[in-house]
C-alpha cells in the first residue's frame, strides 16, 4: 500500500481467483483514543472501533471510503484504490491501446518545435468518475523538472456503438535547451483513476523523436507564362523553431485530385518554394519535416489548383 | 578550416557534408526509430558518448560569439563515432550486409572530421569507451543504439553548419 | 498487369516526320501520365516530354518545343508522338512510359526503332 | 537545365561483389532522383525512386542513398542478371534528365 496523495492510498492486489489480498491497517488521524467506529463509504454498518482497523482487501467491494467518527462527528477519511496485477502485468484497462506506433501504446505525444513544450493525449471509452494527474521530468535517475497543467477532455468521438474520450495535457520543460542533443529521455507519467481502480502509464521519449511540425502557412500559387507548370510558394509555420537558418524543414509538394487513387506530381524541396504542374479539380499541398532528423511529417496545407 | 588557432571552417562544405551525413546515417539503420531502445538500459550503454550540450556553444547565440567551442566538440564527436564504427561492435559478428551504408557513414565522418581539423593540429579528443559485448545479439542491440545516438549527433551538428554558412560564411 | 505495345519500326529521309504509336493496356488509361522517351544507339536516354490523357494537357523538353506533338486518343487508349523534320541525329529507339507519377517512368513500352536517313 | 554526371562510365566487378554507382546533380536536387537498369536490346527498368525508396519486385540488394547533389546506387551483391547500365534521373524540375549511364561489366 502506498499514498498517491493526502489520505488517499492505493493497494496493489494480485488479481486472480481465490487470492488471500492485502491486510491493510487504517489509522485514524485523531488524537482521540476511545469511542471510535468505522465505516466505508455511505454505509452506516460499523466495521470496527478503535483507533486502528484492519481489513483484508481483496476486491473491489473492500475498496472505497473508509472514515473514522466519534459521536457522530467525522474524525477522518482514508479513500482506498485498487491498482490490479494479473499474470504479473498491470491492468490497463481505463485507457485505449493506440497501436501507433506499437502495440501497447496508451500515451501519445507530440511536439511542434525544440522548445521543450510537448502535448500527450490518450483515448478512453469510460466518460464518468474517471480522474487523471500528469506528472514529467526529464530522466528519471536525477530528474530535471516539466511542469505539466491539468489533463483536460480534448475530444469526444464515436467509433461505432462506442463513444470515444480524447484527454490531453500540455507539459513544458523548465529549462529547455533547443540547441542541444538531448540525452536524457523525457519520462512522462500519467494516473488514472476509475471509480475505485487505480492505473498509471509511463511513456519515455526524446523530443527530437516526437516533432511533428505544423503544416506551412501562406500557400500561394503564381501561374507561369506559356506553361502548364505553376509556382508554389509558401512559408515556415509560426511554431517552428527560430532561426530557420538553424532549425531547418525539408518540404514535400504535391498535386493531387481528391481521390489517393489519381495520378499525381510530386516534387521535394528544401526551399520555401517549387514549380509543379496543375490539374483542373486538383489541389496543391504542402507538409513539412525536420530537415536533418526524420521525425514525423506535418499535416499537409492545401490550396485548390483553380 | 576550424583550427584551434581559431580561423573559420569551410562551413558550405561542411553543411554539405554533414547534411550528406544526416541521409547516411537515417539509411544505415532507419527502421531503428521504430524500436523502443530505451527498454533496455539506454542511459547506462550511450551514456559514454559525446553528446552536444546545452553550455557548448552549439546555438546561434554560441555560434555568434564563438564558433570554436562548438566545432572541437563537433570534432571530437566525429572522431568518437568514426572509432565506434571501426570498432568490432560493427566489424564483428553478426556481418553487418554488404549493402549497408555503415562504410559510406564511416569514411563520411573521418571526413568531416578532417575538414575540421587539418593533419598538424590536434584537439583533445575523448576516450573510446571499452564497450566490447560478447554475444552477437548484445551487440547489435548496441549497433542500433550507436546509429540511434548518431543520427540525433550529426542532426545537431548538420544545423550548426547550415546556419553557419547561412550567417557566418564571410 | 499495366502494358505498353508500340508500332513497329520505321525509316525516315531527313525533313520528313514520323508518327509512332503507343497502345495501353491494363489500366484506365486517363489515370496514367504518358511519357516519350528517347535513346540514340549506344547512347543515353533522353526526355521528351509528357501527355496527360484526362485533358490532354502537355510539356515538351525545349529541344523538342515546335518540332514534337503528342497526342492521345482515349476510346482506343492509344498515344502518338510525332516527330517534324527529321534530321540523321533523330536517329534512335522511341519509348513511351505511363505512371501514377509525373517526374519518373515506372512502366516501359519495348520501343520503337526510328531511322533517319538519306 | 539540370546535369547529371554518373561515374565511373564503367565498373568491372566479379560476381557476388558490391557495386557502387555515384550520380552527381549540378545543382541541388533535395531527393528528387531515381535509377533505372537497362539490359541490351531492352527498355530501361525503375530500380529506386526518390533517392532510396525501393520498389516491389525489386531484388533487396539494391538499394540509394544521397540527397542535395550527391547519390549513390548500391548493388550488395551483384548477380549475372544485373550486369547491365544503370542511369539515374532527376526530376527536381523540368526538363526531366538522365545521368550518362554506368555500365557494370563482368571482371
Known amino acids: 500500500i502506498w499514498e498517491l496523495k493526502k489520505d488517499v492510498y492505493v493497494v496493489e492486489l494480485d488479481w486472480y481467483p481465490d487470492a488471500p489480498g492485502e491486510m491493510v491497517v487504517l489509522t485514524c488521524d485523531t488524537p482521540e483514543e476511545d469511542g471510535i467506529t468505522w465505516t466505508l463509504d455511505q454505509s452506516s454498518e460499523v466495521l470496527g472501533s478503535g483507533k486502528t482497523l484492519t481489513i483484508q482487501v481483496k476486491e473491489f467491494g473492500d475498496a472505497g471510503q473508509y472514515t473514522c467518527h466519534k459521536g457522530g462527528e467525522v474524525l477522518s477519511h482514508s479513500l482506498l484504490l485498487l491498482h490490479k496485477k494479473e499474470d504479473g502485468i498491470w491492468s490497463t484497462d481505463i485507457l485505449k491501446d493506440q497501436k501507433e506506433p506499437k502495440n501497447k501504446t496508451f500515451l501519445r505525444c507530440e511536439a511542434k518545435n525544440y522548445s521543450g513544450r510537448f502535448t500527450c493525449w490518450w483515448l478512453t471509452t469510460i466518460s464518468t468518475d474517471l480522474t487523471f494527474s500528469v506528472k514529467s521530468s526529464r530522466g528519471s535517475s536525477d530528474p530535471q523538472g516539466v511542469t505539466c497543467g491539468a489533463a483536460t477532455l480534448s475530444a469526444e468521438r464515436v467509433r461505432g456503438d462506442n463513444k470515444e474520450y480524447e484527454y490531453s495535457v500540455e507539459c513544458q520543460e523548465d529549462s529547455a535547451c533547443p540547441a542541444a542533443e538531448e540525452s536524457l529521455p523525457i519520462e512522462v507519467m500519467v494516473d488514472a483513476v476509475h471509480k475505485l481502480k487505480y492505473e498509471n502509464y509511463t511513456s519515455s521519449f526524446f523530443i527530437r523523436d516526437i516533432i511533428k511540425p505544423d503544416p506551412p502557412k501562406n500557400l500561394q500559387l503564381k501561374p507561369l507564362k506559356n506553361s502548364r507548370q505553376v509556382e508554389v510558394s509558401w512559408e515556415y509555420p509560426d511554431t517552428w523553431s527560430t532561426p530557420h537558418s538553424y532549425f531547418s524543414l525539408t518540404f514535400c509538394v504535391q498535386v493531387q485530385g481528391k481521390s489517393k487513387r489519381e495520378k499525381k506530381d510530386r516534387v521535394f524541396t528544401d526551399k520555401t518554394s517549387a514549380t509543379v504542374i496543375c490539374r483542373k479539380n486538383a489541389s496543391i499541398s504542402v507538409r513539412a519535416q525536420d530537415r536533418y532528423y526524420s521525425s514525423s511529417w506535418s499535416e499537409w496545407a492545401s490550396v485548390p489548383c483553380s | 578550416r576550424a583550427v584551434p588557432g581559431g580561423s573559420s571552417p569551410a562551413w558550405t562544405q561542411c553543411q554539405q557534408l554533414s547534411q550528406k551525413l544526416c541521409t547516411l546515417a537515417w539509411s544505415a539503420h532507419p527502421l531503428v526509430g521504430h524500436m523502443d531502445l530505451r527498454e533496455e538500459g539506454d542511459e547506462e550503454t550511450t551514456n559514454d558518448v559525446p553528446h552536444i550540450q546545452c553550455g557548448d556553444g552549439c546555438d546561434p547565440q554560441g555560434l555568434r560569439d564563438n564558433s570554436q567551442f562548438c566545432l572541437q566538440r563537433i570534432h571530437q564527436g566525429l572522431i568518437f563515432y568514426e572509432k565506434l564504427l571501426g570498432s568490432d561492435i560493427f566489424t564483428g559478428e553478426p556481418s553487418l550486409l554488404p549493402d549497408s551504408p555503415v562504410g559510406q557513414l564511416h569514411a563520411s565522418l573521418l571526413g568531416l572530421s578532417q575538414l575540421l581539423q587539418p593533419e598538424g593540429h590536434h584537439w583533445e579528443t575523448q576516450q573510446i569507451p571499452s564497450l566490447s559485448p560478447s554475444q552477437p545479439w548484445q551487440r547489435l542491440l548496441l549497433r542500433f543504439k550507436i546509429l540511434r545516438s548518431l543520427q540525433a549527433f550529426v542532426a545537431v551538428a548538420a544545423r550548426v553548419f547550415a546556419h553557419g554558412a547561412a550567417t557566418l560564411s564571410p | 498487369q499495366v502494358q505498353l505495345v508500340q508500332s513497329g519500326a520505321e525509316v525516315k529521309k531527313p525533313g520528313a516526320s514520323v508518327k509512332v504509336s503507343c497502345k495501353a493496356s491494363?489500366?484506365?488509361?486517363?489515370?496514367?501520365?504518358l511519357h516519350w522517351v528517347r535513346q540514340a544507339p549506344g547512347q543515353g536516354l533522353e526526355w521528351m516530354g509528357w501527355?496527360?490523357?484526362?485533358?490532354?494537357?502537355?510539356e515538351y523538353a525545349p529541344k523538342f518545343q515546335g518540332r514534337v506533338t503528342m497526342t492521345t486518343d482515349t476510346s482506343t487508349s492509344t498515344a502518338y508522338m510525332e516527330l517534324r523534320s527529321l534530321r540523321s541525329d533523330d536517329t534512335a529507339v522511341y519509348y513511351c512510359?505511363?505512371?501514377?507519377?509525373?517526374?519518373?517512368?515506372?512502366?516501359w513500352g519495348q520501343g520503337t526503332m526510328v531511322t533517319v536517313s538519306s | 537545365e539540370i546535369v547529371m554526371t554518373q561515374s565511373p562510365a564503367t565498373l568491372s566487378v566479379s560476381p557476388g561483389e558490391r557495386a557502387t554507382l555515384s550520380c552527381r546533380a549540378s545543382?541541388?536536387?533535395?531527393?528528387?532522383l531515381h535509377w533505372y537498369q537497362q539490359k541490351p536490346g531492352q527498355a530501361p527498368r525503375l530500380l529506386i525512386y526518390f533517392a532510396s525508396q525501393s520498389i516491389s519486385g525489386i531484388p533487396a540488394r539494391f538499394s540509394g542513398s544521397g540527397s542535395g547533389t550527391e547519390f549513390t546506387l548500391t548493388i550488395s551483391s551483384l548477380q549475372s542478371e544485373d550486369f547491365a547500365v544503370h542511369y539515374c534521373?532527376?526530376?527536381?524540375?523540368?526538363?526531366?534528365?538522365f545521368g550518362g549511364g554506368t555500365k557494370v561489366e563482368i571482371k
Open positions: 491494363g489500366y484506365t488509361f486517363t489515370d496514367y501520365y
Open positions: 534521373q532527376q526530376s527536381n524540375s523540368f526538363p526531366l534528365t
Open positions: 501527355i496527360d490523357p484526362e485533358n490532354g494537357d502537355t
Open positions: 512510359n505511363a505512371n501514377k507519377e509525373l517526374r519518373y517512368f515506372d512502366v
Open positions: 545543382q541541388s536536387i533535395s531527393i528528387n
